[in-house]
């Protein structure tokens, strides 16, 4: 057999990506519900966990135990500014753990706490599964990438998430760097090129500079927006809505959680729709106190609401170029990343800003970043092919590295956007006579004191001989290999005295018991999972089997074909069967596949008596096979307000 | 007129397979769902599940999954339930039964004894 | 699973008295979309296989007398046998197919 392969992951803080390198080319592989990317959700109810679109259909439902948005907690502290922040606009708790967030849900009947690794480790889990299913086998080695300015803190907990998923972490990869990996692929050999790539997506915003010369790549600059995305403007399009439906109706719906959530779910689809149309209808039927909201937009006026956001998204861009040390004239490709880069607006703010320049749309914006994650997991494993066995990654400290001098100053040794490995090297000596060692205090962070950046480690460099103050010569050495690990020397020159410290940030990490413990309670969830996804598949082909017959007898195609007994058979039928899934959603899996095989005795036969002569089969997803056939449960696709 | 006709009474021992046939004549056998019932002497009634007589796919009762197995033969309209591993408890008349709203049309039930 | 309770475990009533059997559920066998009760009535006469008496709490089967009728919903149901014959002497059994199927322990009615 050949070589498991291993798989690149997009880990996005509202959706997930996965991808494979294999016979020559990528596949992004779409999950069970067709879709190429899955949202990173993960709910928890009184009788199951779900993760992925099955967690978001049903987040109005239950919003206080549905989790998303762990990238904006992971590897951060419960005190970091930007989680106290950001805290204020989640419907679930996060509490404070020794310092460490963790997510409180009620799941089971019982109080839960998970650290943002377990949530991050569950989407994982769900995206490594994905794989495996198109795969047809184990999946363990993996490429995950994370956005260009997480520190090392963050990229350690990311691929700790990933070790409680049962992955092998190949590499943390930058996202832009796996988005430009996607696109070199079939652009070496053009010299050297300059390459901006704008990142708008749910809700962060990247935006990055690289070099693309023959197959290498090099990070020059990263610049951006942690909260601007698409979520943004479809806020922006609710909030319009909710005006419109009090000037319609006299009524505000903005306190109605399910209403809000109903509105904010077909605003989304009018803002895709925009993307492609000049307008949008929205049809909503009883979104509040049973009043129907029906209505549309018109691109220009989305355009309007938004374009303050739309326009802010070139300050990144200047940005980038100032640190780049680039003028606009010297990019020489623009890379669109994320579903947002698709509003044709965006596109065109960009390209004129560029003075006309073409965009490079060849990449699906959505797949671009799990793209390069996969190829280069296919490198990391040793692919010869000769698409990829050229290329060298050239990755970049994201934040500067430094070291605390006399009254906190922060030092800087490897400036942020340095191409890693790197190694440098800097003399530094004592600050007062006869001192007899040095405390080396490691930090990373752009602040010119260190107080506002984050420590990562400290060592003490003893023994140094007595001598008045500046004379002693300290050697600091910073060396960042290709993964990022940072180890940091002291010699004094004098004796030859050395010192050191590798800096992997275990400091606020998961101890290797905690991750033994929640590899291990991730194997226990995915058990009942299983039994869950069962449930579940056994009600969706109930559900999908009930609206197929029930849509199909009442075809006007049919008139004249079928009688009134055995239309009304089939429609009572039908109908017993949906109104006791509405009040038995939580029903075994027996009892689901019972009611299907109930309402397949009485439709089969009616049905398939309407196609037998016709040709060929009855319509798609109805089961109309002769006896012995199929059950013909049709597609488990299902949309939940 | 719609009958329900099933085999004849069995003696087996412990450890023996049973095969009871249920044959319908007067209907469309197709066209609805045959259930099985169990009645233990002197006690009440058990349903053990049913066959979708149109897919052949069966449904046990939790109390029926294992050693029981429905079948059905659409050519010759009849259905079978087949016990294997029989023991002293599995002793009881076995009824068919066909369904559309309801148990509306039953077999004359079959008598099966298991004794050493 | 559901549990159907039946009550009285046996009954004996008079020649042309009425004869009341009640049926229990442990939960609600209404359904609201259909306004139904999936409970049905079944008679079996000794040596007899059973005999559908009365479908969705209150639908008599054809051929079954106007003396027998079914009332209820949710989880209370009754049968009742309005004026008792002979030939009504019978072990009676509930039945549930709001999910799956359960058959009640049955009631024997005797004539007094």
């Known amino acids: 057999m050949a070589k498991a392969a291993a798989i690149g992951i997009d880990l996005g803080t509202t959706y997930s990506c996965v991808g494979v390198f294999q016979h020559g080319k990528v596949e992004i592989i779409a999950n069970d519900q067709g879709n190429r990317t899955t949202p990173s959700y993960v709910a928890f109810t009184d009788t199951e966990r779900l993760i992925g679109d099955a967690a978001k259909n049903q987040v109005a439902l239950n919003p206080q135990n549905t989790v998303f948005d762990a990238k904006r907690l992971i590897g951060r502290k419960f005190g970091d500014p930007v989680v106290q922040s950001d805290m204020k606009h989640w419907p679930f708790q996060v509490i404070n753990d020794g310092d460490k967030p963790k997510v409180q849900v009620s799941y089971k009947g019982e109080t839960k706490a998970f650290y943002p690794e377990e949530i991050s480790s569950m989407v994982l889990t769900k995206m490594k599964e994905i794989a495996e299913a198109y795969l047809g086998y184990p999946v363990t080695n993996a490429v995950i990438t994370v956005p260009a300015y997480f520190n090392d803190s963050q990229r350690q907990a990311t691929k700790d998430a990933g070790v409680i998923a049962g992955l092998n972490v190949l590499r943390i990869i930058n996202e832009p760097t796996a988005a430009a990996i996607a696109y070199g692929l079939d652009r070496t050999g053009k010299g050297e090129r300059n390459v901006l790539i704008f990142d708008l997506g749910g809700g962060t915003f990247d935006v990055s500079i690289l070099t693309i010369d023959d197959g290498i790549f090099e990070v020059k600059a990263t610049a951006g927006d942690t909260h601007l995305g698409g979520e943004d403007f479809d806020n922006r399009l609710v909030n319009h809505f909710v005006e419109e439906f009090k000037r319609k109706h006299k009524k505000d719906i903005s306190q109605n959680k399910r209403a809000v959530r109903r509105l904010r779910t077909a605003c989304e689809r009018a803002k895709r729709t925009l993307s492609s149309s000049t307008q949008a209808s929205l049809e909503i039927d009883s979104l509040f106190e049973g009043i129907d909201f029906y209505t549309s937009i018109t691109r220009a006026r989305f355009e309007e609401l938004c374009s303050d956001l739309f326009r802010s998204t070139l300050e990144p861009v200047e940005k980038a170029l100032r640190d780049a040390k680039l003028d606009k004239a010297q990019i020489h490709d623009l890379v669109l990343v994320g579903g947002s880069t698709r509003i044709p607006k965006v596109q065109k703010l960009l390209q004129d800003f560029f003075n006309g320049r073409d965009l490079n749309k060849s990449i699906n914006p959505d797949e671009a970043v799990a793209y390069g994650a996969a190829v280069q997991a296919a490198i990391l494993m040793g692919d010869k092919s000769e698409n990829v066995q050229d290329l060298l990654l050239l990755d970049v400290a994201p934040l500067s590295l430094g070291l605390e001098t006399a009254g906190g100053v922060m030092t800087a040794l490897i400036k942020r956007n340095s191409t890693i490995p790197t190694k440098q090297t800097q003399i530094f000596t004592t600050y007062s006579d006869n001192q007899p060692g040095v405390l080396i205090q490691v930090y990373e962070g752009e602040r010119a004191m260190t107080k506002d950046n984050n420590l990562l480690g400290r060592f003490e460099l003893s023994g140094i001989p007595p001598a008045p103050r500046g004379v002693p010569q300290i050697e600091v050495t910073f060396d960042i290999d290709a993964n990022g690990i940072l180890n940091v020397t002291a010699t004094d020159k004098s004796t030859g005295k050395a010192n050191k410290i590798t800096i992997t940030n275990d400091k606020g990490r998961l101890s290797k018991e905690e991750i033994e413990r929640m590899v291990q309670e991730a194997e226990k969830y995915k058990a009942e999972d299983e039994v869950q996804r069962e449930r579940v598949s056994a009600k969706n082909a109930l559900e999908s089997y009930a609206f197929n017959m029930k849509s199909a007898v009442e075809d006007e195609g049919l008139k004249g074909k079928i009688s009134e007994a055995d239309k009304k058979k089939v429609l009572d039928k039908c109908q017993e069967v949906i109104s006791w899934l509405d009040a038995n959603t939580l029903a075994e899996k027996d009892e689901f596949e019972h009611k299907r095989k109930e309402l397949e005795q009485v439709c089969n036969p009616i049905i398939s008596g309407l196609y037998q002569g016709a040709g060929g089969p009855g319509p798609g997803g109805f089961g109309a096979q002769g006896p012995k056939g199929g059950s013909g449960s049709g597609p488990t696709i299902e949309e939940v307000d | 007129q719609i009958q329900l006709v099933q085999s004849g009474s069995e003696v087996k021992k412990p450890g023996a397979s049973v095969k009871v046939s249920c044959k319908a004549s007067?209907?469309?056998?197709?066209?609805?769902?045959m259930n099985w019932v169990r009645q233990a002497p002197g006690q009440g009634l058990e349903w053990m599940g049913w066959?979708?007589?149109?897919?052949?796919?069966?449904t046990y009762a939790d109390d029926f999954k294992g050693r029981f197995t429905f079948t059905t033969d659409t050519s010759t309209s009849t259905a079978y339930m087949d016990l294997r591993s029989l023991r002293s408890d599995d002793t009881a008349v076995y009824f068919c039964?066909?369904?559309?709203?309801?148990?509306?049309?039953w077999g004359q039930g079959t008598l099966v004894t298991v004794s050493s | 699973e559901i549990v159907l309770t039946q009550s009285p475990d046996s009954l004996s009533v008079s020649l042309g008295e009425r004869a009341t059997i009640k049926c229990k559920s442990s939960?609600?066998?209404?359904?609201?979309?259909?306004?139904?009760?999936?409970l049905a009535w079944y008679q079996q006469k000794a040596g007899q296989s059973p005999k559908l008496l009365i479908y969705?709490?209150?639908t008599r089967e054809s051929g079954v007398p106007d003396r027998f009728s079914g009332s209820g919903s949710g989880t209370d149901f009754t049968l009742t046998i309005d004026s008792l014959q002979t030939e009504d002497v019978a072990v009676y059994y509930c039945?549930?197919?709001?999910?799956?199927?359960?058959f009640g322990g049955g009631t024997k009615v005797e004539i007094k």
């Open positions: 039964a066909r369904y559309d709203h309801a148990m509306d049309y």
């Open positions: 039945k549930q197919s709001y999910t799956l199927y359960t």
């Open positions: 007067g209907y469309t056998f197709t066209n609805y769902g």
């Open positions: 969705w709490t209150s």
């Open positions: 939960q609600s066998l209404l359904n609201s979309g259909t306004r139904k009760n999936y």
């Open positions: 066959i979708n007589t149109y897919t052949g796919e069966p």
